[in-house]
């Protein structure tokens, strides 16, 4: 029986009946064994076939077998109901070997020419399986010449059998207080040959509750307990399971904060698996009762470990833990069933005693000493000498703990001194130098510091004066001795003030004329305003109408009198304003340099002389009565004049204050 070619020789060739293409002889038996490499199969087809036809091919036949299986028994020329001829059919070995047997019996009724066949080895596509057969690979099958290999989807690993995909389903840890876990691919069939471990690990104090949901289908056995696939649940206290079959297991209250779930599958079966919904519980904390004037958030039926609540107080109340106010409060439930912080109180907001108002007072409207939420107080200024600036003085204790005005301001109102009040009434006639009476010139300030000079009080902590009067002290403000509230220059009874800073107009040049002869002194403390100490007003925009030529102003001071000495008592003089051109002309002739009188000056005095300010009056105010407001304002500052005070044809020259209002306002607001 000749053998076909052996692998690794090329596996292809021709087979023919003995004597082909001639007729074959009787009593012939020929056997060919063809072998292909592993992973290959043999393909065979006939190009000629002419054998004696007999019932079930009992006489002459060609038999094809692969291993123990007969693939075909062939005879005749064409197939009948009971006999088969190859025709155009191609035959394939089941494995890598093919046996071909030719036999003829003892006689033929007529000559038959036999057969001719061709064969070749070809790759087996192991990945293609017949319908109903198990797939070659669990997931992915990859064919190649001479063989195949399997691979797995992500999350799986190829089993050592090289065909099954085992799930990578271990090491998952669930730490949330509730969640879901299921068999791999649920609700599709779970993978074979897998061992899954899931852990639920909650904080100590929690207890895990397991509920099987939807469906449960794990391969089982009618007699043996879960021999194939099974689910086990392990805690530090006990083991539950194994579970298999189609019945949903009952709820498991583990009484443990850690649970391990193990799921093991074998190599067979087609089951959908399981799904677990887990929750947790813990020892509940006492139900939080909100304090009076407060509420709890969030509101829950119960509060267990890690649950929290906050307390919010009603408007006008604040949180108080013991005796310490809190901005916020949150308590957390602990594993022993107690809250981590005691319940706070909601205490009514207290704005505290209102600040004292300088030169004013405060009155409790709601009740004596009541300073809590919505309490009302009323600030007022000391009558006559002070007036309230900014608001009406009514303040309410608001929820933020601040006393707040009706305009929403949290700062105190301001009691501003009333300016320009004088006990003196003016007449139309011009009088000679006269002694001032108490309250006539309450703005008058005596400045001592090297020389005697004067100034006028502005507000309650500024003094307006002439630059030349304080020039020497500009860098040593503390050297200025400032006195007010007295008529007698040498009296020991006066109000003392000290200078904090001296501001000389930047346009003033010492010893080079008197243009911009103006200065401000900031006092280091506010002075108390009364009938003897009252500020002078600054001129309004409309003030020019009270300072026309021949309008009368009043100058006051302790300067030289006709006797040539400084006055002991404060003196004053009423003098008219002089036409500016007339004044300019008076100081055009020697010994005065041209341009001595500038637009920043005004002149006052009598052409005949005799009424004037003099040395020692420098810096004092030339004041005018505003007949509309009935208040006195400063129109001029005693600056300079003729060498001989009160000289006929010469006039007193004063700094024109209205030209300096922006400068004054800027200094005062900046400092």
């Amino acid at each position: 029986t000749p053998l076909g070619p052996k692998w690794p020789e090329p596996v292809f060739g021709r087979l023919a009946s003995p004597g082909f293409p001639g007729e074959y002889a009787n009593d012939q038996e020929r056997r060919w064994t063809l072998t292909a490499p592993p992973g290959y199969r043999l393909r065979l087809y006939f190009t000629h076939f002419d054998l004696e036809l007999s019932h079930l091919c009992e006489y002459d036949f060609v038999k094809l077998s692969s291993g123990a299986k007969v693939l075909a028994t062939l005879c005749g020329q064409e197939s009948t109901d009971t006999e088969r001829a190859p025709g155009k059919d191609t035959f394939y070995s089941l494995g890598s070997s093919l046996d071909i047997t030719f036999r003829s019996d003892y006689s033929n009724e007529k000559p038959f020419t036999g057969f001719e066949a061709f064969y070749a080895a070809e790759d087996i596509d192991e990945c293609q399986v017949a319908p109903g057969e198990a797939p070659t690979c669990d997931h992915h099958c990859h064919n190649h010449l001479g063989g195949f290999y399997c691979s797995c989807r992500a999350g799986y690993v190829l089993h050592r059998n090289k065909r099954t995909c085992s799930a990578l389903c271990s090491g998952q840890v669930f730490t949330q207080r509730s969640g879901e876990l299921s068999s791999p691919e649920y609700p599709r069939p779970y993978p074979k040959l897998s061992s899954c471990t899931y852990s639920i690990s909650l904080e100590e104090g929690f207890s895990v509750i397991l509920d099987f949901v939807e469906s449960f289908d794990v391969e089982t056995h009618p007699e043996t307990l879960c021999p194939y696939d099974f689910l086990k649940i392990q805690t530090d206290r006990e083991e539950h399971g194994p579970f298999c079959g189609k019945t949903l297991p009952h709820r498991i209250e583990t009484k443990s904060n850690t649970v391990t779930i193990t799921f093991v599958t074998d190599e067979s079966g087609d089951h959908t698996g399981w799904k677990i919904h887990y929750t947790s519980t813990a020892q509940p904390c006492p139900y939080p009762m909100a304090p009076p004037n407060g509420h709890v958030s969030p509101v829950q039926a119960k509060y267990i470990l890690k649950d929290s609540f906050s307390i919010f107080c009603e408007t006008g109340y604040e949180l108080l833990q013991g005796h310490l106010p809190l901005k916020s409060f949150t308590a957390v439930c602990q594993k022993d069933g107690s809250w981590d912080r005691p319940m706070p109180a909601c205490s009514i907001v207290d704005c505290g005693p209102p600040d004292d108002l300088p030169s004013g007072r405060v009155e409790y409207i709601t009740g004596p000493g009541v300073t809590t939420y919505k309490a009302v107080i009323q600030y007022s200024c000391e009558e006559t000498f002070y007036t309230m600036k900014v608001n009406d003085g009514k303040y309410v204790c608001e929820a933020d703990g601040f006393w707040t005005s009706s305009k929403g301001e949290k700062s105190l109102p301001v009691c501003e001194p009333v300016c320009g009040l004088s006990a003196r009434t003016t007449g139309g006639r011009i009088y000679g130098g006269q002694k001032a009476k108490p309250g006539d010139f309450p703005w008058q300030v005596l400045i001592l510091g090297g020389t005697t000079a004067a100034g006028a009080l502005l507000y309650d902590n500024w003094v307006l004066t002439a630059a030349h009067a304080v020039y020497e002290q500009k860098h040593d403000a503390s050297a200025l001795d400032i006195r007010m509230g007295t008529l007698k220059r040498l009296s020991p009874h006066y109000t003392q003030a000290w200078s904090e800073a001296v501001f000389i107009h930047e346009g003033y040049t010492h010893d080079a004329g008197f243009d911009n002869d103006i200065a401000l002194i900031k006092l280091n403390n506010k002075v108390v305003i009364n009938s003897n100490i009252t500020p002078i007003c600054l001129p309004r925009k409309e003030a020019e109408s009270f300072m026309r030529t021949d309008d009368i102003g009043t100058a006051s001071g302790w300067g030289l009198t006709q006797r040539g000495f400084l006055a002991r008592n404060l003196m004053y003089v009423d003098i008219p304003i002089v036409d500016h051109q007339k004044c300019t002309a008076a100081y055009e002739k020697p010994p005065y340099p041209r341009g001595s009188v500038t637009a920043n000056m005004l002149c006052a005095g009598l052409e005949s002389g005799g009424k004037d300010s003099c040395r020692g009056d420098s810096g004092g105010a030339l004041v005018f009565l505003d007949s509309e407001t009935e208040r006195w304002f400063v129109g001029g500052i005693v600056s300079w004049g003729s060498m001989n005070c009160g000289e006929a044809g010469q006039y007193g020259v004063y700094t024109k204050v209205i030209n300096y209002i922006p400068w004054i306002e800027n200094i005062i607001s900046d400092f």
Epitope: L320, G322, H323, L324, P325, L326, K327, S347, D350
Partner: antibody, heavy 121, light 105 residues
């Protein structure tokens, strides 16, 4: 006018117990909205809070010194007493008492002038 | 609980000096500030983050957000040269910062 005045020994030996008294005036120790704190300051160093007591006898102590401190009050005498056991040279400091209030959210609005305590053998 | 302050801050007269105080979630607590001059007792200058006690000049102001509280001295003057301490309460215990020395140049 609210004032607080500390008194106690100037010199203490190591291992001894220090007793300091704070005498208050201008407010009452029974005032529900006020309390008294003790604070100390070693030479050239920062302030360190020690303890406080409120009108209802609510007390609190510094965690690091709790085992050594005791605070108490005698409302009738307007006095708050602090005792500190097992004194050590590192406890050398100026010891202050101060008033605290709900109004100031525990801010200490009036302080005593302080008493200097030296711990040395 | 720890409150952290810079050791020193300097400012020229008239300028603004800002002192910070940082601590975990400090904005959730009320902060007080104290001024202490050499050889003197501390003086409360700010309480409840922003409030000024009576008699404290308006140039002192406070704020407190997030993890940082700030004491601001606007228009610093020579008299403001001192040590400044922040203070808060944590679980009923008082805590002071390490202090900041303010120097007026």
């Amino acid at each position: 006018q609210v004032t607080l005045k500390e008194s106690g020994p100037v010199l203490v030996k190591p291992t001894e117990t220090l007793t300091l008294t704070c005498t208050v005036s201008g407010f009452s120790l029974s005032n529900a909205r006020m309390g008294v704190s003790w604070i100390r300051q070693p030479p050239g160093k920062a302030l360190e809070w020690l303890a406080h007591i409120f009108s209802n006898d609510e007390k609190s102590y510094s965690t690091s010194l709790k085992s050594r401190l005791t605070i108490s009050k005698d409302t009738s005498k307007s006095q708050v007493v602090l005792t500190m056991t097992n004194m050590d040279p590192v406890d050398t400091a100026t010891y202050y008492c101060a008033r605290m209030a709900i109004l100031t959210a525990g801010g200490m609005d009036v302080w005593g002038q302080g008493t200097t305590v030296t711990v040395s053998s | 609980y720890v409150l952290t302050q810079p050791p020193s801050v300097s400012a020229s007269p008239g300028q603004t000096a800002s002192i910070t105080c940082s601590g975990d979630k400090l904005g959730d607590k009320y902060v007080s500030w104290y001024q202490q001059k050499p050889g003197r007792s501390p003086v409360l200058v700010i309480y409840r983050d922003t409030k000024r006690p009576s008699g404290i000049p308006e140039r002192f102001s406070g704020s407190n957000y997030g993890n940082t509280a700030t004491l601001t001295i606007s228009g610093t003057q020579a008299v403001d040269e001192a040590d400044y301490y922040c203070q808060a309460w944590d679980s009923g215990s008082g805590v002071f910062g390490g202090g900041t020395k303010v120097t007026v140049l």
